[in-house]
C-alpha cells in the first residue's frame, strides 16, 4: 500500500534520499515457521521480487511523504503444502536512478521479519511494520492453485456438477463431496475439468486443452487427447481416466501418478502444482550490489549469486562490515573501500594493519652503529660519532656548531673534527691563548672582552 517515513521519527526523509528519481523493489521471502532468523536459512517456502515498479521523482524542498505503491501483486509460489505458520521477510530495496546519483545504485532500506499464522483461502490480512525510521503498509494472503483446496492446499478438488448440499454458486469437490468449492467466478461455460481461473470472467486451460472455454482437446495424433489409436475397426480407444490425462503439468513439466492424484516434476525456474508459476531466475536480476548470477546446482535453487568483495547473502544484499572485525591494530582507523580494506595508522605506527610500532626498539635498529634508547613511551636513537637524525641515517656535520674558538678553522674528519687554530691560539678547540714569552698558555677571554693585563691571571 505505501512505504515511507514513520510518524514522529524526527526529520522525515524520502525513500529517494533527495538524490533524484528512484525505484522501490520489494523482495518477499517465506521461511518455515520454525526458522530462526539467526540461522540464515534459505527462503525455503519461496521468494519473489516485485515487478510492477514505478519511478518516483522527488522535487527539492518537497516535504517527504510515504510513497504510494502500485497494485502489482508480489506472487510467491510455494512448494508442497501450505504450512500455515511461516516467517515472512519483506525487504525494501531502493534503486537510485540518474547519472549523478552518487553512492551505490542499490540500497537495502528496510527489512521486516515476523512470524505469521495464515490459512490458505482466507481474506487479505493487513499489516503495518516499522523498522528504523521506515514504515511499510501491506496486505498478504495465501491461495491454493487449482485444483488444490483446503487450509493447507493439500487436497485436490475436481468440480462435479452433480446435485449436492452446497449452496447456490458453490460446487462439491471430488473426491470430497462434503467439501464445497469457492464461488465460481470463471467465464460462464469454462470447463470445470480442463479450465480454471484466477480472475473473474477468465478461462485458462490446462495443458492439452484449448478453446475459449477449454473444451477443445489439443490433437497430438489422429486420436483426440488421451485416446490412443486402436485396431482399424475400432478407431480410437479411450483408456480409463487417469490423473495425468491431458498432462496437467505446464512449461514442460512431467506428470507422474501418485496415489490417485498427480505430481509434476517441474523444469528449472518453474514451480507450483502444475509448474505454472515461474520462479526467480537470473533473468529476474536477483543479485544485488554487482553480484554475478549463475545457475544453481539443485533443482530448488534456480540461481546462485557470486558476490563481489564486501557483500554477502543469498542475493548479495548484505554489506559485510569488515571493519567490525577491527583489523587495524594500535588504534588505527579502518576504511572499507569496497574492493579492499585500508588502515589509517596513528603517529608512531605503520604497516598494512598498523602492526609495526615505530616507537618501539623491538625489531627496529638504529643505523650506523647507533643504539636504541626507550623511555617515556617513545624511543630514540643515540647515534655514533658522525651520525644523527631519528634513525642515525644522516651523516652529521661536526662543524655545524662552529666548535673552533678564536677564528680557528674547522675540518670534518671520519673520527670527528679537527680545529686549525689561528696564530696565538692552541688546544683541541683553539680555546687557549699562547703566551709570547713561552709561559704556559692561559684560557683566552671570550671575544669582546678587553684583556688589559694578562699577568693578573697568573
Amino acid at each position: 500500500h505505501s512505504f515511507g517515513p514513520g510518524p514522529g521519527l524526527g526529520t522525515p526523509r524520502s525513500p529517494c534520499n533527495a538524490r533524484g528519481p528512484c525505484r522501490l523493489f520489494f523482495r518477499v521471502c517465506l521461511k518455515p515457521g520454525v526458522s530462526q532468523e539467526a540461522t540464515e536459512s534459505l527462503c525455503a517456502l519461496g521468494a519473489a521480487l516485485s515487478t510492477s515498479v514505478p519511478v518516483y521523482t522527488e522535487h527539492p524542498g518537497e516535504s517527504a511523504a510515504a510513497l504510494p505503491l502500485p497494485d502489482g501483486l508480489v506472487r510467491v509460489p510455494f512448494r508442497d503444502a501450505w504450512p500455515g505458520t511461516f516467517s515472512l521477510v519483506i525487504e525494501t530495496w531502493r534503486e537510485q536512478l540518474g547519472e549523478h546519483a552518487g553512492g551505490p545504485a542499490w540500497n537495502l532500506l528496510a527489512r521486516v521479519v515476523g512470524r505469521r499464522r495464515l490459512a490458505a483461502g482466507g481474506p487479505w490480512a493487513r499489516d503495518v511494520q516499522r523498522t528504523g525510521t521506515w514504515e511499510l503498509h501491506f496486505s498478504y494472503r495465501a491461495r491454493c492453485e487449482p485444483p488444490a483446496v483446503g487450509a493447507a492446499c493439500a487436497r485436490l478438488c475436481r468440480s462435479r456438477s452433480a446435485p449436492s448440499r452446497c449452496g447456490p454458486g458453490l460446487r462439491p469437490c471430488t473426491p470430497f463431496p462434503d467439501e464445497c468449492e469457492a464461488p465460481s467466478v470463471c467465464r460462464p461455460g469454462c470447463s470445470p475439468e480442463h479450465g480454471y481461473c484466477e480472475e473473474p470472467d477468465e478461462c485458462r486451460c490446462l495443458e492439452g486443452w484449448t478453446g475459449p472455454l477449454c473444451t477443445v482437446p489439443v490433437s497430438t495424433s489422429s486420436c483426440l487427447n488421451s485416446r490412443v489409436p486402436g485396431p482399424a475397426s475400432t478407431g480410437c480407444l479411450l483408456p480409463g481416466p487417469g490423473p495425468c490425462d491431458g498432462n496437467p503439468c505446464a512449461n514442460g513439466g512431467s506428470c507422474s501418478e501418485t496415489s490417485g492424484s498427480f505430481e509434476c516434476a517441474c523444469p528449472r525456474g518453474f514451480y507450483g502444482l502444475r509448474c505454472e508459476v515461474s520462479g526467480v531466475t537470473c533473468a529476474d536480476g536477483p543479485c544485488f550490489n554487482g553480484g554475478l548470477c549463475v545457475g544453481g546446482e539443485d533443482p530448488d535453487s534456480a540461481y546462485v549469486c557470486h558476490c563481489p568483495p564486501g557483500f554477502q547473502g543469498s542475493n548479495c544484499e548484505k554489506r559485510v562490515d569488515r571493519c567490525s572485525l577491527q583489523p587495524c591494530q594500535n588504534g588505527g582507523l579502518c576504511l572499507d573501500l569496497g574492493h579492499a580494506l585500508r588502515c589509517r595508522c596513528r603517529a608512531g605506527f605503520a604497516g598494512p594493519r598498523c602492526e609495526h610500532d615505530l616507537d618501539d626498539c623491538a625489531g627496529r635498529a638504529c643505523a650506523n652503529g647507533g643504539t636504541c634508547v626507550e623511555g617515556g613511551g617513545s624511543r630514540r636513537c643515540s647515534c655514533a660519532l658522525g651520525f644523527g637524525g631519528r634513525d642515525c641515517r644522516e651523516r652529521a656535520d661536526p662543524c655545524a656548531s662552529r666548535p673552533c674558538a678564536h677564528g680557528g678553522r674547522c675540518y670534518a674528519h671520519f673520527s670527528g673534527l679537527v680545529c686549525a687554530c689561528a696564530p696565538g691560539y692552541m688546544g683541541v678547540r683553539c680555546e687557549f691563548a699562547v703566551r709570547p714569552d713561552g709561559a704556559d698558555a692561559v684560557p683566552a677571554a671570550p671575544r669582546g672582552l678587553r684583556q688589559a693585563d694578562p699577568q693578573r691571571f697568573l
Partner: antibody
C-alpha cells in the same frame, strides 16, 4: 540423452597454449552451468571454474584465474577452456561437467605438457 | 576457501559389508554437498546431491547424510561394482572444493 563430447588428447610444449572443447547435447544448453574440473595423475579433483551460458557469467577458482579462460558458443552448444603458459604441472585430465543434481560429465581431455 | 577433509584415504571391505566414507568441511556448508564415484580411466559419476538426495538411477544401497560441517556416504551392502574412488564436493561457496578422495577396494 544428455551428453558432453570433449576434444581429444593434446601433447604440447612448455609455454604454449591449448584450447579444449566440450560439445553439449540433449538439453537446453543455456539452462545450466558448465564446470571445468582438473585431475592430475593419481590426484584428487580440482574445480577450475564455471560458465553460465544463459548470461555468460563466469566464476573462476582464483588459483586458475591466470591459467584458464572459459568461453561458450551458444549457437553450437559448445564450451571451451583455453589454458596458457603451460608447464609440466598442467599435465592432467580436464573434464567439463554439469555438476548439478543430475551430474553429467564429459569423457575427459588428456593434456601432456612436455618438451 | 573451504577445505574438505575426506577420510579414510583408502578402505578395504568385504562384499556385503557396510561401508562409510566421511567428509568434514572447514566451515558450515549447509548441506550443499555432492558425492561422486570414479572408476579407473572413467569420468566421475554423481551419486548424491544436497547431502542426502539420491541421483536418479543410482542404486538405493547408496545413501548420504550429515549437516553443518560433517557428512558421510554409506554403502549399505558392498557389491563388486562399487570398487573405485569416491569424492565429496562442497558447492556452498565459491570456489567449489573437492575432498581428497577415498579408494575403495574389495578384501
Amino acid at each position: 540423452e544428455v551428453q558432453f563430447q570433449q576434444s581429444g588428447p593434446e601433447l604440447v610444449k612448455p609455454g604454449a597454449s591449448v584450447k579444449i572443447s566440450c560439445k553439449a547435447s540433449g538439453y537446453t544448453f543455456t539452462d545450466y552451468n558448465i564446470h571445468w574440473v582438473r585431475q592430475s595423475q593419481g590426484k584428487s579433483l580440482e574445480w577450475i571454474g564455471l560458465i553460465y551460458p544463459f548470461n555468460g557469467g563466469i566464476v573462476y577458482n582464483q588459483k586458475f584465474k591466470s591459467k584458464a579462460t572459459l568461453t561458450v558458443d551458444n549457437s553450437s552448444t559448445s564450451a571451451y577452456m583455453e589454458l596458457r603458459s603451460l608447464s609440466s604441472e598442467d599435465s592432467a585430465v580436464y573434464f567439463c561437467a554439469r555438476l548439478n543434481w543430475e551430474g553429467y560429465w564429459g569423457q575427459g581431455s588428456t593434456l601432456i605438457v612436455s618438451s | 576457501d573451504i577445505k574438505m577433509t575426506q577420510s579414510p584415504s583408502s578402505i578395504y571391505a568385504f562384499l556385503g559389508e557396510r561401508v562409510t566414507i566421511t567428509c568434514k568441511a572447514s566451515q558450515d556448508i549447509n548441506s550443499y554437498l555432492s558425492w561422486f564415484q570414479q572408476k579407473p580411466g572413467k569420468s566421475p559419476k554423481t551419486l548424491i546431491y544436497r547431502a542426502n538426495r539420491l541421483v536418479g538411477g543410482v542404486p538405493s544401497r547408496f545413501s548420504g547424510s550429515g549437516s553443518g560441517q560433517d557428512y558421510s556416504l554409506t554403502i549399505s551392502s558392498l557389491e563388486y561394482e562399487d570398487v573405485g574412488d569416491y569424492y565429496c564436493l562442497q558447492y556452498a561457496e565459491f570456489p567449489y572444493t573437492f575432498g581428497g578422495g577415498t579408494k575403495l577396494e574389495i578384501k
